[in-house]
Amino acid sequence: VSPTFQVVNSIAPVQECSTQLDIVIVLDGSNSIYPWDSVTAFLNDLLERMDIGPKQTQVGIVQYGENVTHEFNLNKYSSTEEVLVAAKKIVQRGGRQTMTALGIDTARKEAFTEARGARRGVKKVMVIVTDGESHDNHRLKKVIQDCEDENIQRFSIAILGSYNRGNLSTEKFVEEIKSIASEPTEKHFFNVSDELALVTIVKTLGERIFALEAT
């Protein structure tokens, strides 16, 4: 080093990647979702990619149809293995209605509270999986805005199976589920042709969720 070398200013160290995320998965459990084991297979493949723990990523699951159930809270399990066991046991609760706005709003207001394990200053992520237009569509815009106001990153997944089986147009449905996703939509919205195809998006979805850790 040259004798004239001197430190003129100090550079802040490169920020470490945070491994902390609070993720709530919001599952449509209405009767039109079939087969349910395709949903549990999707959960299994997604969750086994996560480093779950009280100081790492936490995961909670909410299921909705006509009403909403907290399957488990963010702080319920402290390892990936425990969460995988619990997720496999989630039973489809059914219902003839798809109250997506209610599901999302309940996740925001309840699942992301400190009482249920949400951590201050930790990035909030919501993954919404549904196969049909919501029956409470009129509430959706406000519910999404409330999530936006609370900086909840949203990934939405549209399962087109029921529409394809009924030869119905998917246009309105896709439009609705796209509206749920955070911007940019093309990075936060997914659609699959049928329930069994859910597992095919796990790798990409996982990568995009983990990319949030670095931001």
């Epitope: 079939y34 039973v91 059914g94």
Partner: antibody, heavy 125, light 107 residues
Framework: QVQLQESGPGLVKPSETLSLTCTVS????????WSWIRQPAGKGLEWIGR???????NSNPSLKSRVTMSVDTAKNQFSLKLSSVTAADTAVYYC????????????????????WGQGTTVTVS | EIVLTQSPGTLSLSPGERATLSCRAS???????LAWYQQKPGQAPRLLIY???SRATGIPDRFSGSGSGTDFTLTISRLEPEDFAVYYC????????FGGGTKVEIK
Amino acid sequence: QVQLQESGPGLVKPSETLSLTCTVSGGSISSHYWSWIRQPAGKGLEWIGRVYSSGSTNSNPSLKSRVTMSVDTAKNQFSLKLSSVTAADTAVYYCAREGYDFWSDYYNYYYGMDVWGQGTTVTVS
Amino acid sequence: EIVLTQSPGTLSLSPGERATLSCRASQSVSSSYLAWYQQKPGQAPRLLIYGASSRATGIPDRFSGSGSGTDFTLTISRLEPEDFAVYYCQQYGSAFTFGGGTKVEIK
């Protein structure tokens, strides 16, 4: 009325691959899940796996590594391949349709396997 | 996986009698996804009941299903000669599994 017919060799050598086809007549293969089930002589029923008309599949975790399923919508057929067979795979193999009905719009109600093939006996020897 | 246990293994009854078959699941099953099948020797199974209690098309009303959660029952109110067969329950909410079967035989 939808009818299903299984076809394939009745005898397969150990370690080889069992291949069966199910032909759907009297209706379209589209928009349904289609399953394979087997039954060893004098025993109960075991689900092997299912294929959707789009080609998506899932299968029994205990057989997953050996099972391949596919669908040919042009021929109205779906097929099963089971690799590395042993004598324990000797059974009657059935194909079946997973039935559903619509309540309204896209709300379909599933009701299990409503149409079955008559079954085909496969012996591994 | 969800294990289904059927009892009794064999039921010996006379025509005209009432048959009650039980199916117990190792964990809760959505009642939307429990079915009953009848199988006669040399034949494929036939769907009798779906959604725990709904009769499939063409099934006579002497067959009825009930139950929820982990306990389900198939009842045949008055046995006809053609009802003597093996009966299987099946759950189709989480990777299809079948019970071991109950054989209803003539006493």
